[in-house]
Every structure is written in structure tokens, then in C-alpha cells.
């Protein structure tokens, strides 16, 4: 004969476990329903009844099957050096990303909680390293016979013309001038970009770290100050 | 031990000023790279301004002009000079360290608080 099907609450096997998408509770020694996506338990399941569940309320979500009391907050609104890539629903949280010619100072599970702009190098320095998602650009002095002279996020220093007859020598801020006779260069003239970050959806995905230091660390450094609490607010 | 104390807010009205300090101990002040990062009520943080080891620094749109960053390497003080303050700059004012080449904040002081009334 076939097994009977147990309906919600049943008394588990001893030593056995709940079946998916229900929950052992302690108080009824029953095995209960969880809750979907976007629910959270509203009445826990006692020996005769099921766990009732409700709706997240608004800027609240639950993204898992679960029997939590309350839905989580969604987190803080995104400011205005962040891009909201994906909204706050009953069933999962908002993510901020950062802007264009920004960069994640201080990550979080998903997404950024925040952006700094990315360091614009100054006349006579240029880009050692380029900018990423989450991580600032590195200037460095232009080397004797290079030059920048922008302040730029992309710009990296670039080789003197090579002049025939120097008019003016070039320095790590200015080329050179040459007399009216053709100069030749080893590259092409104008500024010289890197490429700029192309911003795409978190891939912020470790756990969020002891709260003792700010999130994404992995420098060994004593362990300081922790970032503000984060605030959460309804839309 | 590593701290960040934050001092030199208050209460202000519309257009006044005020220079924040942070004090920073316990680290090497000049290998970082120092911020500050406000956090209005109910909001996230935002980034203010930055100041870099050759002394460049950085604003952010909202306050440009208005907003000096300076530091003091032999005193280890961050400071920011706060000028025509507008009711929207209400907020904690947090000052940050990023050690050079890591890209993440690391400490973080407790935060001073600045109230601008209209």
C-alpha cells in the first residue's frame, strides 16, 4: 500500500526530518508549512493548526520559504551617486550600484553601500592603474620623458614628440615644442584613455564580515572602527 | 589601537559655517587616503570629499565650492571647513580612512553631527 500523505501539522517520524518548505516547531513538535516568497508567518502552527501566513508590507521582503515573525527591511533608498538595478519588492531587497565614474568603497552582500568617485590624476600624473567596480584609480608621476596634461580618470602619461629642434622641452605636465620643422613621436598624439569600468549588476556575493570592520576588507591591517549602522527607510 | 574622534559640530543656521576635525591615532595617517562620508537621517551614507597623499582632493557635486578637505600630517587631523551651509547637509559627518591600493574604507570614526536649521 501506498505511504499515506501527512498533511500539515504532522508529528515527524522519530529521528526523522520535515519535508521541503516546512520547519520543525519546537513549541507544537510538529512539522509546519513555511512561508513563501514574499509571506512571512503571521500565526505559528500549533498541534492542530498550520502556520498562517501574511504579505510583507510595503519596502519590506522575505526572498526565501521561511517562518520569520517579521519581513526584513528593505534597505535605504539609493543616493544620488547610485543606480537602483534592482527595486525593492515584497520578495527581494533593493540593490544600489554605483554610477559611472564611480566606484564600491564599501560593499555589503549585494550591491554597494558606497560610492566614491573615481581619483581624477592631475597634470603630471597619470593612470597607473584604472578604475574598476570596486576599485579606485592609482596615479603615479609621469616618468622623465612622458607627460599628462589633464586631470582624468583614464589619462596615462605619454612620450614627448621627439623634435628635430626643441622650441620648448617638455616636462611631466607639457609636451614638448618643437621649431616648425615636423616632429615624430612614438605614439599617436592626444590623450590616452583607459577603459572605464563598465558598471554591471553586483557580484558582491561573500557574507558580510564581522561588523568589527567595514565589509570587503582583506588587508591585514588591526581591526579599527566599524561603518556607521546602516539605515533602513520606507518608500 | 586605531581611532578616528571626530569633533566641531553643532547647531547652525542657513549660510554659517563650521570646520570639523578628526583626530586620527594608531595608524600611519599619510599611507591613507581620508574622507568624509555623511549620513542624513533615514538615509545611506554619502561621500563628501577625499583628500589624497600628494594633497589632491576630490568633492562631490553637492557640496563643491562650499566645502574645503585639508589634513595635517604632523598633527594626524583630517579637517573640513564647512562654508554657506544649507539645511540639506544635515547629517552625521563620519571621517574614513582607505589605506592606499586596498580600495576599501577601513576605519571609521563615530561621527559628529551637524544641524543646519533655515
Known amino acids: 500500500l501506498p505511504a499515506q500523505v501527512a498533511f500539515t501539522p504532522y508529528a515527524p517520524e522519530p529521528g526523522g526530518t520535515c519535508r521541503l518548505r516546512e520547519y520543525y516547531d519546537q513549541t507544537a513538535q510538529m512539522c509546519c508549512s513555511k512561508c513563501p516568497p514574499g509571506q512571512h508567518a503571521k500565526v505559528f502552527c500549533t498541534k492542530t493548526s498550520d502556520t498562517v501566513c501574511d504579505s510583507c508590507e510595503d519596502s519590506t521582503y522575505t526572498q526565501l520559504w521561511n517562518w520569520v515573525p517579521e519581513c526584513l527591511s528593505c534597505g535605504s533608498r539609493c543616493s544620488s551617486d547610485q543606480v537602483e538595478t534592482q527595486a525593492c519588492t515584497r520578495e527581494q531587497n533593493r540593490i544600489c550600484t554605483c554610477r559611472p565614474g564611480w566606484y564600491c568603497a564599501l560593499t555589503k552582500q549585494e550591491g554597494c553601500r558606497l560610492c566614491a568617485p573615481l581619483r581624477k590624476c592631475r597634470p603630471g600624473f597619470g593612470v597607473a592603474r584604472p578604475g574598476t567596480e570596486t576599485s579606485d584609480v592609482v596615479c603615479k608621476p609621469c616618468a622623465p620623458g612622458t607627460f599628462s596634461n589633464t586631470t582624468s580618470s583614464t589619462d596615462i602619461c605619454r612620450p614627448h614628440q621627439i623634435c628635430n629642434v626643441v622650441a620648448v622641452p617638455g616636462n611631466a605636465s607639457m609636451d614638448a615644442v618643437c621649431t616648425s620643422t615636423s616632429p615624430t613621436r612614438s605614439m599617436a598624439p592626444g590623450p590616452v584613455h583607459l577603459p572605464q569600468p563598465v558598471s554591471t549588476r553586483s557580484q558582491h556575493t561573500q557574507p558580510t564580515p564581522a561588523p568589527s570592520t567595514a565589509p570587503g576588507t582583506s588587508f591585514l591591517l588591526p581591526v579599527g572602527p566599524s561603518p556607521p549602522a546602516e539605515g533602513s527607510t520606507g518608500d | 589601537h586605531v581611532q578616528l574622534v571626530e569633533s566641531g559640530g553643532g547647531s547652525v543656521q542657513a549660510g554659517g559655517s563650521l570646520r570639523l576635525s578628526c583626530a586620527a591615532s594608531g595608524f600611519t595617517f599619510s599611507s591613507y587616503y581620508m574622507s568624509w562620508v555623511r549620513q542624513a537621517p533615514g538615509k545611506g551614507l554619502e561621500w563628501v570629499s577625499a583628500i589624497y597623499s600628494d594633497d589632491s582632493d576630490n568633492y562631490s557635486d553637492s557640496v563643491k565650492g562650499r566645502f574645503t578637505i585639508s589634513k595635517d600630517n604632523a598633527k594626524n587631523t583630517l579637517y573640513l571647513q564647512m562654508n554657506s551651509l544649507k539645511p540639506e547637509d544635515t547629517a552625521m559627518y563620519y571621517c574614513?580612512?582607505?589605506?592606499?591600493?586596498?580600495?576599501?574604507?577601513?576605519?571609521w570614526g563615530q561621527g559628529t553631527q551637524v544641524t543646519v536649521s533655515s
Open positions: 574614513a580612512a582607505i589605506r592606499i591600493g586596498t580600495d576599501q574604507y577601513k576605519f
